[in-house]
Amino acid sequence: TCEIVTLDRDSSQPRRTIARQTARCACRKGQIAGTTRARPACVDARIIKTKQWCDMLPCLEGEGCDLLINRSGWTCTQPGGRIKTTTVS
């Protein structure tokens, strides 16, 4: 389960209301860090181990997911044809 945490605003600059947001994720046994719907998420460790990246549903709703060659990452293809590529190191 992940929640979005807003870190404290920059109090040294009162006119600025910029706040940093970060995900705080507590994974269950058998889960590790991943990406679901383009956001940080806890996913089945077996997905990461086998590099079946699309099984963690990393793309936004309506986008198509495809594995990169050698399972080095994935691509998310928008309905309009724009492709976003994510590689895993």
Partner: antibody
């Protein structure tokens, strides 16, 4: 090099308490789930306890549940095991172990016994009157 | 409980296989020689630490993991424990250990 160095063992009396420590070096301690595993003389390995990388989650084996408390100090890169109401069957060598998975920032991760990639040399505990 | 054979024997140069089943998530294999520290030879099913010889390999099939030592050497004689999570997925568990004898 990854180093895990246990301490705190020795001769203990039944009903007493002890606190084991495991000093870690050579890696980012705060990114790894950690374990305590023990081995009675001439016997096999037994799962004792584990803790998430950030210390928010703990788990215990049935033999020590209710008598043991695992904790960690990520600032000092040290793992602890507090054992109360000691019994003769707690006698054995206690090992500290690291789960290989590197948990990224913002995540709290459990280790996995099958992912243990590093062990300490162990500290011997003898519970006897 | 995990299931692994109590003993396995092989001649030098032969292939030794040790199986472990009954757990979930991932499996590891831990070597222990008399009077020596525990050494991980395989973790996360098939990962091998950099200082472990390539003759050690692990493979997962279903819920059974097999440790294979290809070209067994005399120094491989030891007790081998498998480790994983119990079937409930809530706590760690170890096999009773397999004694590998090199004939």
């Amino acid at each position: 090099a990854v180093t895990l160095d246990e301490s705190g063992g020795g001769l203990q009396t039944p009903g007493g308490a002890l606190r084991l420590s495991c000093s870690a070096s050579g890696f980012d301690f705060s990114s790894h789930g950690m374990f305590w595993v023990r081995q009675a003389p001439g016997k096999g390995l037994e799962y004792v306890s584990e803790i998430t990388n950030d210390g928010s989650g703990t788990n215990y084996g049935s033999a020590v549940k209710g008598r043991a408390t695992i904790s960690r100090d990520n600032g000092q890169s040290t793992l602890y095991l507090q054992m109360n109401s000691l019994r003769a069957e707690d006698t054995g060598t206690y090992f500290c172990a690291r789960s290989s998975y590197v948990c990224p920032g913002g995540f709290s991760c459990w280790g996995d016994t099958g992912q243990i990639d590093a062990w300490g040399h162990g500290t011997e505990v003898i519970v006897s009157s | 409980a995990l299931t692994q054979p109590s003993s396995v024997s092989a001649n030098p140069g032969e292939t030794a296989k040790i199986t472990c089943s009954g757990g979930v998530y991932s499996y590891g294999w831990f070597q222990q020689k008399p009077g020596s520290a525990l050494v991980t030879v395989i973790y996360w099913d098939d990962e091998r630490p950099s200082d472990i010889p390539s003759r050690f390999s692990g493979a997962l099939s279903g819920s059974t993991n097999t440790l294979t030592i290809t070209g067994v050497q005399a120094e491989d004689e030891a007790d081998y424990y498998c480790g994983t999570e119990d079937i409930s997925g809530t706590a760690g568990v170890f096999g009773a250990g397999t004694t590998l004898t090199v004939l």
